[in-house]
């Protein structure tokens, strides 16, 4: 039975130019992290391989930064990369847990127009 | 299309150490691993370790720590697997295979021909 | 170490049969298993992954199921050309180990 949850970064907003850490954190189980895979709609992003390591898809190389931990890091954002994310934990022997985030990329006087009325 | 091609046949004495090679071609080479497979003569398949090509981590079987060694050159899209200290029991055909680890299911897709290594005083 | 135990170890059945071939893992591995077929004199190949995704070009009448420790891989209807050895393979994590194989021959 698949007891675990997933915790993410939920929605999410940055500047046009910037740089965002996409998080997910595995909970509530003991099942064995093999392999921690991240996608953009369809697009593989990268990998983390519990044996090999980081592995980065050759079209984002220059754009996206292993880590921190099993998050990824996603940098020159363009409004483009606005949309959903996935992390997908390959585990045993629960099989498969999948977490989602919203990343909404905004023009820079945007962003800071609207940090203005962010509530702490 | 996606080729491995080996080295080929070797015959060393107990003791002595053995290098097989595996040229990849048909696919970006570092966006892979690739894995080492044996059989000696009537038996089974034998996992022996695998190594990423994109960061030249390993991971070898428990039974070969110390006496394996894999390494990639990217330059040349090729796999290398040496044994060291060889006994009689360590005659078996050879494989490399491509690792497709993208999915998270680490299967082995593609196969090399096979390098058959008899150890023999 | 997960151990993978394969039954039986050898068969024989007609052309047209339907064959079953069994692997078992000592630890739930959801279905992070793959079949391989190695043909007499041949190189591996490999015939399903995730337990039970054909693997491209792959003849349908190949099939696996199964998840947790159970695991099962049937030809629906045995061909000459299906005569060779199966493997399964647990391929969540190292050690990737196969099982110990099970012969296929036709009666």
């Known amino acids: 039975m698949m007891t675990g949850t997933i915790e993410t970064t939920g929605n999410i907003s940055a500047e046009k130019g910037g740089s965002i850490i996409l998080q997910c954190h595995l909970s509530s189980t003991t099942a064995q992290v093999t392999q921690v895979n991240w996608e953009q709609q369809d697009q593989l992003l990268a990998i983390c391989n519990a044996d090999l390591g980081w592995h980065i898809s050759p079209s984002f190389k220059d754009r996206v930064a292993p880590g921190p931990g099993l998050g990824l890091t996603l940098q020159s954002l363009t409004v483009n990369d606005t949309g959903e994310y996935f992390c997908i934990y390959h585990t045993y022997p629960d099989g498969t847990y999948t977490g989602r985030i919203f990343l909404e990329v905004l023009e820079s006087s945007v962003a800071e127009h609207g940090a203005r009325f962010q509530i702490p | 299309q996606v080729q491995l091609v080996q080295s080929g046949t070797e015959v060393k004495k107990p003791g002595a150490s053995v290098k097989v090679s595996c040229k990849a071609s048909?696919?970006?080479?570092?966006?892979?691993?690739i894995t080492w497979v044996r059989q000696a003569p009537g038996q089974g398949l034998e996992w022996m370790g695998w190594?990423?090509?994109?960061?030249?981590?390993?991971n070898y079987a428990q039974k070969l720590q110390g006496r394996v060694t894999m390494t990639t050159d990217t330059s040349t899209s090729t796999a290398y697997m040496e044994l060291r200290s060889l006994r009689s029991d360590d005659t078996a055909v050879y494989y490399c295979?491509?690792?497709?680890?993208?999915?998270?299911?680490?299967?082995?897709?593609?196969w090399g021909q096979g390098t058959l290594v008899t150890v023999s005083s | 170490d997960i151990q993978m135990t394969q039954s039986p170890s050898s068969l024989s059945a007609s052309v047209g049969d339907r064959v079953t071939i069994t692997c078992r893992a000592s630890?739930?591995?959801?279905?992070?298993l793959a079949w391989y077929q190695q043909k007499p004199g041949k190189v591996p190949k490999v015939l399903i992954y995730?337990?039970?995704t054909l693997q491209s070009g792959v003849p349908s009448r190949f099939s696996g199921s199964g998840s947790g420790t159970d695991f099962t891989l049937t030809i629906s209807s045995l061909q000459p050309e299906d005569v060779a050895t199966y493997y399964c393979?647990?391929?969540?994590?190292?050690?990737?180990?196969f099982g110990g194989g099970t012969k296929v021959e036709i009666k």
């Open positions: 295979a491509r690792v497709d680890f993208w999915s998270g299911y680490n299967y082995f897709d593609y």
């Open positions: 048909g696919y970006t080479f570092s966006s892979y691993a």
């Open positions: 190594i990423s090509a994109y960061n030249g981590n390993t």
């Open positions: 630890q739930g591995i959801s279905n992070y």
């Open positions: 995730a337990a039970s």
């Open positions: 393979q647990k391929s969540n994590s190292a050690p990737l180990t």
